[in-house]
C-alpha cells in the first residue's frame, strides 16, 4: 500500500499584503502563506544558497497590475513536512511548482540529506502545461522502506542559473528497536565485577532495556537505552542478553557467554623434532588456555640415570611458538621432558613426560704423548701417540685425524690424513726438505672430531744431514712442546 503523504497547498491568492518586518524567506511563498496562522516575519535565504540568510528591505505590493495575475511564486508549494511510517511499507511524496512557459527547460532533482539521488530511484516528474505556466509535480516513491531511508528529502530546480529549493520532507521510518551496541562475550576473573553495555534506537523512541541472565530477567524495571549492567562477580559461566522494547515491539540481542578465567590445561603431544649430542628440539600442543591468554611456558628436563642426583633443569620460554630447543645437555644421555604453561591465573599441570636421548658427542680430549721423528730414509715422518681416555658419552672411537703443516721460506701447506681406530702410529711422506713440519692429532667418533693435540714440530733438513732425533709432545703440564733434533 502506498502512503500518499501529500498536503495540497491552497490556491495562491494575489499578493496578500506586506509581511511585518523586512525579512522574507526565499522558499516560503511571499504571494501566499498556506498552513500558517497569521503572517510571521521570516528569514530571506540567498537565491543561490538556501539556508544562508541575507537581509533585504523589500516591501511586497498588495495590488499588482493585470499582467502579474497569472504569475505564480518562484517557490515550491508547501507540502507535508513529516511522514512517519513503519518499516517495509511503501511511501510516495511530491513537490510541485508552477513555472512560466518561458522557462521550458527546467528540471527537478531530488536530494536526500544533502546528496543528490541519482540512478535507481523511483522519481517521476509530470508536466501540466497551461497557456502561461506549466505546473510541475515531481513525485518520489519508495517501496518497502527501510531504516536507511530515514532522512530529509528536498527538491531542487534551476532557473536562470539559480537553485530554487523546496522545504524539506522528513521521512521517519519506524520499526522494532535496532541495536547499535550489543553486549560482548567476556572472560572475567572469578568474583570480580564487570560491566555489560546495551544500546538500541528507534524510531520510535524511547527504547527501554531489560537484562537477561541465563534466561531470567535481571532488572524488574526497564532502563532507558543505553543501559550499562554492572555484574558484581560470577563464580561460574553465565549467558547474558538484553531485550530492547519500543512501541513497535521487542528485539532481543545475541546471547553472550561470560567465562570464568582458570588455570590452563596441561600441554599435550610433546614431540621430539631433532636431537644432537647436546640439544633436543621439542614441540607441544597447548592445552585449553582457561579463558586467559598464555603468558609463558616452562620446559622441565630430568636426566634418566640411576647415578644422577635426579635434579630437574627448568627452561622458561615464551608461549608461542610452541617449540623450544633444550641446550647444554650431556651427550649420549637419556632425559625425561615435560612442559607446563601459565596464564594470568597460574601454571598448568605438567604435560605427560616423554623420554628423549642425546646422540653421542665428539671426543673431549686429544690423543696423548704424540711423538714425531724422521725415519732413516728421510723420506717419511713417523708419528706415534697414545689413545685418549674418552668418556662413554663421546661414543665409540672410529679413528684419528692427523693435521701436518709444512712451512718453508714463506710457504705454508696443510694436509689432513685419516687413520683407523686400531692404529696408534702413522707414517707420512716428507713433502718439503729444509722445512718445518707441525703435527697435530684429533680423535674421531661418530659424534664428530675431538680437539687436536698440541702441535709438535720437527725440522726436515736438506739432503745430506744426519739427524734422527724424535720430537714429542711434552708431559702434561708443560707449556710448550719440545723440538728435539
Amino acid at each position: 500500500a502506498i502512503t500518499e503523504a501529500r498536503e495540497e497547498a491552497k490556491p495562491y491568492p494575489l499578493f496578500p499584503g506586506p509581511l511585518p518586518g523586512s525579512l522574507q524567506t526565499d522558499h516560503t511563498s511571499l504571494l501566499s502563506l498556506p498552513h500558517t496562522s497569521g503572517y510571521q516575519p521570516a528569514l530571506m535565504f540567498s537565491p543561490t544558497q538556501p539556508g544562508r540568510p541575507y537581509t533585504g528591505n523589500v516591501a511586497i505590493p498588495r495590488v499588482t497590475s493585470a499582467g502579474s495575475k497569472l504569475l505564480p511564486p518562484l517557490a515550491f508549494k508547501h507540502t507535508v513536512g513529516h511522514i512517519i511510517l513503519s518499516e517495509h511499507k511503501d511511501v510516495k511524496f511530491n513537490c510541485s511548482i508552477s513555472v512560466p512557459n518561458i522557462y521550458q527547460d527546467t528540471t527537478i532533482s531530488w536530494w536526500k540529506d544533502g546528496k543528490e539521488l541519482l540512478g535507481a530511484h523511483h522519481a517521476i516528474t509530470q508536466f501540466y502545461p497551461d497557456d502561461e505556466v506549466t505546473a510541475i509535480i515531481a513525485s518520489f516513491s519508495i517501496t518497502s522502506v527501510q531504516r536507511s531511508d530515514n532522512g530529509s528529502y528536498i527538491c531542487k530546480m534551476k532557473i536562470n542559473n539559480e537553485e530554487i529549493v523546496s522545504d524539506p520532507i522528513y521521512i521517519e521510518v519506524q520499526g522494532l528497536p535496532h541495536f547499535t551496541k550489543q553486549p560482548e562475550s567476556m572472560n572475567v576473573t572469578r568474583n570480580t565485577a564487570f560491566n555489560l553495555t546495551c544500546q538500541a534506537v528507534g524510531p520510535p523512541e524511547p527504547v527501554n532495556i531489560f537484562w537477561v541472565q541465563n534466561s531470567s530477567r535481571v532488572n524488574e524495571q526497564p532502563e532507558k537505552s543505553p543501559s550499562v549492567l554492572t555484574v558484581p562477580g560470577l563464580t561460574e559461566m553465565a549467558v547474558f542478553s538484553c531485550e530492547a522494547h519500543n512501541d513497535k515491539g521487542l528485539t532481543v540481542s545475541k546471547g553472550v557467554q561470560i567465562n570464568i578465567k582458570a588455570i590452563p590445561s596441561p600441554p599435550t603431544e610433546v614431540s621430539i623434532h631433532n636431537s644432537t649430542a647436546h640439544s633436543i628440539l621439542i614441540s607441544w600442543v597447548p592445552g585449553f588456555d582457561g579463558y586467559s591468554p598464555f603468558r609463558n611456558c616452562s620446559v622441565q628436563v630430568k636426566e634418566v640415570d640411576p647415578l644422577s642426583n635426579g635434579s630437574v633443569m627448568i627452561f622458561n620460554t615464551s608461549a608461542s611458538p610452541h617449540m623450544y630447543q633444550i641446550k647444554q645437555l650431556q651427550a649420549l644421555a637419556n632425559y625425561s621432558i615435560g612442559v607446563s604453561c601459565m596464564n594470568e591465573i597460574g601454571w598448568s599441570a605438567v604435560s605427560p613426560w616423554i623420554l628423549a636421548s642425546t646422540t653421542e658427542g665428539a671426543p673431549s680430549v686429544a690423543p696423548l704423548n704424540v711423538t714425531v721423528f724422521l725415519n732413516e730414509s728421510r723420506d717419511n715422518v713417523d708419528i706415534r701417540w697414545m689413545k685418549p681416555l674418552t668418556k662413554r658419552q663421546a661414543g665409540e672411537l672410529v679413528g684419528y685425524r692427523i693435521s701436518h703443516v709444512w712451512q718453508s721460506a714463506g710457504i705454508s701447506k696443510e694436509l689432513l690424513e685419516e687413520v683407523g681406530q686400531n692404529n696408534s702410529r702413522a707414517q707420512i711422506s716428507v713433502q718439503v726438505h729444509n722445512a718445518t713440519c707441525t703435527v697435530r692429532i684429533a680423535a674421531v667418533t661418530k659424534g664428530g672430531v675431538g680437539p687436536f693435540s698440541d702441535p709438535v714440530k720437527i725440522f726436515i733438513p736438506a739432503h745430506g744431514w744426519v739427524d734422527h732425533a724424535p720430537s714429542s709432545t711434552p708431559a702434561p703440564g708443560n707449556a710448550d712442546p719440545v723440538l728435539i733434533i
Epitope: 504571494l31 537565491p47 511586497i60 499588482t64 504569475l71 511564486p73 517557490a75 534551476k158 536562470n160
Partner: antibody, heavy 123, light 107 residues
Framework: EVQLQQSGPELVKPGASVKIFCKAS????????MDWVKQSHGKSLEWIGD????????IYNQKFKGKATLTVDKSSSTAYMELRSLTSEDTAVYYC????????????????WGTGTTVTVSS | DIQMTQSPASLSVSVGETVTITCRAS??????LAWYQQKQGKSPQLLVY???NLADGVPSRFSGSGSGTQFYLKINGLQSEDFGSYYC?????????FGGGTKLEIK
C-alpha cells in the same frame, strides 16, 4: 558596505585575450550570482552572462558565447571574465553587477554595480 | 529575444519639471523590469525593481509603474542631480536586454 572593485584599464592588441576581475566585499560572495555587462562608448548596455559562484554554473547571452568566459575564485571572493580574439568591436567599459531576486518572484535586478573596467583594443 | 524599446531617446527639460520615460517590451514580461540611472563616467545605479519598487536610498520623486508590456519611470520635480542617462532592463526568460536609454539634459 557592499562593493564590487574592478581591475584597471587594459590596452590590448587585436587577436589577443584579456582577463579582468571583479572583487566582491561586504557580503557573502556565494549568496548571489554575478553578472557582466558591456557598454560601448556612447551606447546602451548589453548583458553578457552570469555565473553562480556556488557551483560555477554559467549562462551566456548567445551573442557572447565563445567571446567571454566567466569564472570565480570563491576563496578570494573574485569573479573573472576572459575576453578572447579581441577586435575593435570589443572596445568598451565592462561592468560586473550583483544580481538579486525580489522575494519569491521571477523579478531579478542588479542592485550593486562594479566600478567598471575599460578595455581598449588597438594595434 | 525580447526587445526593449525606450522612448524618448533624449529629453531636454528644466529643473522642477515632471518627466515620464517609457519602456515597451516586445512581449509580456509581467513585472520583471528594472530601471537604472547612469551619470557621465560613472557606473549605473538601481532606481526601481520589479517595475514598481523603489530601491533603497532613491528619492520618492522617482516612481515606477506598468506591467505586461508597457512600463513607465516618472520623475516629479526634477533636481539638477537627476540629469544623466536612464535605462530599463527586463529579466524575463534567460537573456536580459536593456532599453536603448534615455538621455535627460538640462534645458
Amino acid at each position: 558596505e557592499v562593493q564590487l572593485q574592478q581591475s584597471g584599464p587594459e590596452l590590448v592588441k587585436p587577436g589577443a585575450s584579456v582577463k579582468i576581475f571583479c572583487k566582491a566585499s561586504g557580503y557573502t560572495f556565494t549568496a548571489y550570482n554575478m553578472d557582466w555587462v558591456k557598454q560601448s562608448h556612447g551606447k546602451s548596455l548589453e548583458w553578457i552572462g552570469d555565473i553562480n559562484p556556488n557551483n560555477g554554473g554559467t549562462i551566456y547571452n548567445q551573442k557572447f558565447k565563445g567571446k567571454a568566459t566567466l569564472t570565480v575564485d570563491k576563496s578570494s571572493s573574485t569573479a573573472y571574465m576572459e575576453l578572447r580574439s579581441l577586435t575593435s568591436e570589443d572596445t568598451a567599459v565592462y561592468y560586473c553587477a550583483r544580481r538579486r531576486r525580489y522575494g519569491n518572484t521571477y523579478y531579478w535586478y542588479f542592485d550593486v554595480w562594479g566600478t567598471g573596467t575599460t578595455v581598449t583594443v588597438s594595434s | 529575444d525580447i526587445q526593449m524599446t525606450q522612448s524618448p531617446a533624449s529629453l531636454s527639460v528644466s529643473v522642477g519639471e515632471t518627466v515620464t520615460i517609457t519602456c515597451r517590451a516586445s512581449e509580456n514580461i509581467y513585472s520583471s523590469l528594472a530601471w537604472y540611472q547612469q551619470k557621465q563616467g560613472k557606473s549605473p545605479q538601481l532606481l526601481v525593481y520589479a517595475a514598481t519598487n523603489l530601491a533603497d536610498g532613491v528619492p520618492s520623486r522617482f516612481s515606477g509603474s506598468g506591467s505586461g508590456t508597457q512600463f513607465y519611470l516618472k520623475i516629479n520635480g526634477l533636481q539638477s542631480e537627476d540629469f544623466g542617462s536612464y535605462y530599463c532592463q527586463h529579466f524575463w526568460g534567460t537573456s536580459y536586454t536593456f532599453g536603448g536609454g534615455t538621455k535627460l539634459e538640462i534645458k
